[in-house]
């Protein structure tokens, strides 16, 4: 067991038919010695007398909000939450493995430049009853600091006949310096509670592996004189850290068609412009990644090929 | 004589296409590592991201664009860098700063070069073969060094007579590659932001 | 508005051959250009196809066979030939993309004999 | 991506009409043209996007169909329509020609 924050505690169980569990011993914070009784959440059942109270902890129905009391006035709280531990591994019930990039990956991080702002979202079924809490530092052993922001919830799908909810915090490195070489990575935990369920979820990346760009902006096309081809022509986003010859990025130009079985015509440049076949019917599009540091393509900026 | 006079390529800055085959020499050469060394741990997610530079040069702190002098997360062990008023070409208008910068890059280059020419000298003697450095990566570090032309005291290559550990040397040259691609990703960022000045 | 291929010749197997395809009264550089064969006496076979820069082949000429342009000229290279690929080349023009191919040259004759 | 053309060859009398068939593997939804060669001459495209006739081809020339099925129809063949016709289906890697149909008129 131990110390969540005040008052609320975690009692870690091999989860498992008939496992013995853990015995946990709860101790009532006053200065009064008789008269304390314990009861669980809004049951007016008494489980015990004394200071101190001694219960085995096997299920989710041991778990709860314990309250000591003296003549019908609640002297302390305790919240017991379970975190089960099933084969030797952790549960990961609350949150969704997003399978990208690759399986186990319930938290996923990214950055639009270097300057050590980052977001990361997760996904989960589940709709009520659940709270999350992150913390963030760049090393372990020797942590540097990373401040990160309240959790919101920031979108909602539904998949078949589930509901999906993502939710999402950005963090920032308390001092970052946008050209520096990463040698610890950024950390990255998030505690989730369903219920009585306490569930933690890490992440560990370098800044440089998460970059995502955004898309380049100001996309605008030339016709050419007498001619099928045009001049397409796009800018830098906004967010994209300075100074773009410092900072620069390659692009990806593609011409597709209105339908995704005719053939893709791509071009890659280092350019803000290039010269390409438009068609009828066509969207031109262009995408974005660091030039040195083969991290994400951003999303695609698109107009029409008119 | 600090900087090169070498001829001029398509840039203006003769060492920004050097650079670049440099980048791509460093990034094939980790991905041909990894892919033969899979089952030693050398992803970026199971080695220590070591520096040999470290306390040794100041790469990114002596050549930071002037943009992010102001930043003073970015000066917190040295405070230099680089006025862009000169090129590799224009070497007598080259500031002190920017000399400081390419000298800092070449003594990373040299000192990459030593570690990697003493490491293939233990990886040829493994009985498996399994892996040691082609002459393009050797090759494109001593192009970039003649082309920043700095005169420099020869380091002695270092040399052991007891048989290496090839799992750690495996080990250490992972550690060595990654490193490597980072610092190859700085210097560059450097030479075309050169490039542009 | 016209093309015309040139290059073809009478090879030995394994020679490499590069064929040349030049347009009249239109530029080269605003369309798809597409290499096509035709075997004496058989049907036509698609080899492979540039946009602006993007090239897609035929599985089997994928390796053997490479398309590029500049913008004056669409070029078709070949390698390691074999008498199988004795055939008139030609080179067209893609109304839009690559199975549309509204200009047509005259063809020039590959033929690879030892 | 494969294209069966049937079939291989027909006859046709002057004033009959010939319909040719072709068939793709795969879904290639309007991306199908068909074309007309001579014997010693270049191929000359009649129709594209599956149903659109090109400039200056006579009206007798009928393409129809999409997604895997396609059929070009001559009404009222004239003599010099004896040629051979191929079908041209496209992916989005990759372009195929059908194995052809001779069409001989009587």
């Known amino acids: 067991i131990w110390e969540l924050k005040k008052d609320v505690y975690v009692v870690e169980l091999d989860w498992y038919p008939d496992a013995p569990g853990e015995m946990v011993v709860l101790t009532c914070d006053t200065p009064e010695e008789d008269g304390i009784t314990w009861t669980l959440d809004q049951s007016g059942e008494v489980l015990g007398s004394g200071k101190t109270l001694t219960i085995q902890v096997k299920e989710f129905g041991d778990a709860g909000q314990y309250t000591c009391h003296k003549g019908g006035e609640a002297l302390s709280h305790s919240l017991l939450l379970l975190h089960k531990k099933e084969d030797g591994i952790w549960s990961t019930d609350v949150l969704k493995d997003q399978k990208e990039p690759k399986n186990k990956t319930f938290l996923r991080c990214e950055a639009k430049n270097y300057s050590g702002r980052f977001t990361c979202w997760w996904l989960t079924t589940i709709s009520t009853d659940l709270t999350f809490s992150v913390k963030s530092s760049r090393g372990s052993s020797n942590p540097q600091g990373v401040t990160c922001g309240a959790v919101t919830l920031s979108a909602e799908r539904v998949r078949g006949d589930n509901k999906e909810y993502e939710y999402s915090v950005e963090c920032q490195e308390d001092s970052a310096c946008p050209a520096a070489e990463e040698r610890l990575p950024i950390e990255v935990m998030v505690d989730a509670i369903h219920k009585l369920k306490y569930e933690n979820y890490t992440s560990s990346f370098f800044i440089r592996d998460i970059i995502k760009p955004d898309p380049p902006k100001n996309l605008q096309l030339k016709p050419l004189k007498n001619s099928r081809q045009v001049e397409v022509s796009w800018e830098y986003p906004d967010t994209w850290s300075t100074p773009h010859s410092y900072f620069s990025l390659t692009f990806c130009i593609q011409v597709q068609g209105k339908s995704k079985r005719e053939k893709k015509d791509r071009i890659f440049t280092d350019k803000t412009s290039a010269t390409v076949i438009c068609r009828k019917n066509a969207s031109f599009s262009v995408q974005a990644q660091d030039r040195y540091y083969s991290s994400s393509w951003s999303e695609w900026a698109s107009v029409p090929c008119s | 004589r600090n900087l090169s006079v070498a001829t001029p390529g398509p840039e203006m800055f003769p060492c920004l296409h050097h650079s670049q085959n440099l980048l791509k020499a460093a990034s094939n050469t980790l991905q041909k590592a990894r892919q033969i060394l899979e089952f030693y741990p050398c992803t970026s997610e199971e080695i220590d991201h070591e520096d040999i530079t470290k306390d040794k040069t100041s790469t990114v702190e002596a050549c930071l664009p002037l943009e992010l002098i102001k930043n003073e997360s970015c000066l917190n062990s040295r405070e230099t860098s680089f006025i862009t008023n000169g090129s590799c070409l224009a070497s007598r208008k080259t500031s002190f700063m920017m000399a400081l910068c390419l000298r800092s890059i070449y003594e990373d280059l040299k000192m990459y070069q030593v570690e990697f020419k003493t490491m293939n000298a233990k990886l040829l003697r493994d009985p498996k073969r399994q892996i040691f450095l082609d002459q393009n990566i050797l090759g494109v570090i001593d192009e970039l060094m003649q082309a920043l032309n700095f005169n420099s005291e020869t380091v002695p290559q270092k040399s052991s007579l007891e048989e290496p550990d090839f799992y750690k040397t495996k080990i250490k040259l992972c550690i060595l590659l990654h490193a490597f691609r980072i610092r190859a990703v700085t210097i560059d960022r450097v030479m075309s932001y050169l490039n542009a000045s | 508005q016209s093309l015309e291929e040139s290059g073809g010749r009478l090879v030995t197997p394994g020679t490499p051959l590069t064929l040349t395809c030049t347009a009249s009264?239109?530029?080269?550089?605003?369309?798809?250009m597409t290499w096509v064969r035709q075997a004496p006496g058989g049907g036509l076979e698609w080899i492979g196809t540039?946009?602006?820069?993007s090239t897609y082949y035929a599985s089997w000429a994928k390796g053997r066979f490479t398309i590029s342009r500049t913008s004056t000229t669409v070029d078709l290279k070949m390698t390691s030939l074999t008498t199988e690929d004795t055939a008139t080349y030609f080179c067209?023009?893609?109304?839009?993309?690559?199975?549309?191919?509204?200009?047509w040259g005259p063809g020039t004759l590959v033929t690879v004999s030892s | 991506l494969v294209m069966t053309q049937t079939p291989a060859s027909v006859s046709a009398a002057v004033g009959g009409t010939v319909t040719i068939n072709c068939q793709a593997s795969?879904?290639?939804?309007?991306?199908l043209a068909w074309y007309q060669q001579k014997p010693g001459q270049r191929p000359k495209l009649l129709i594209y996007?599956?149903?659109t006739l090109t400039s200056g081809v006579p009206s007798r020339f009928k393409g129809s169909g999409s997604g895997k099925q396609f059929t070009l129809t001559i009404s009222g063949v004239q003599r010099e329509d004896a040629a051979t016709y191929y079908c041209?289906?496209?992916?989005?890697?990759?372009?195929?020609f059908g194995g052809g149909t001779k069409v001989v008129v009587v």
């Open positions: 067209a023009r893609g109304l839009t993309t690559d199975y549309d191919l509204d200009l």
């Open positions: 009264g239109f530029s080269l550089s605003s369309y798809w």
């Open positions: 540039i946009a602006t820069s």
């Open positions: 795969e879904d290639i939804e309007s991306y």
């Open positions: 996007s599956a149903s």
């Open positions: 041209l289906g496209a992916d989005d890697t990759t372009t195929v």
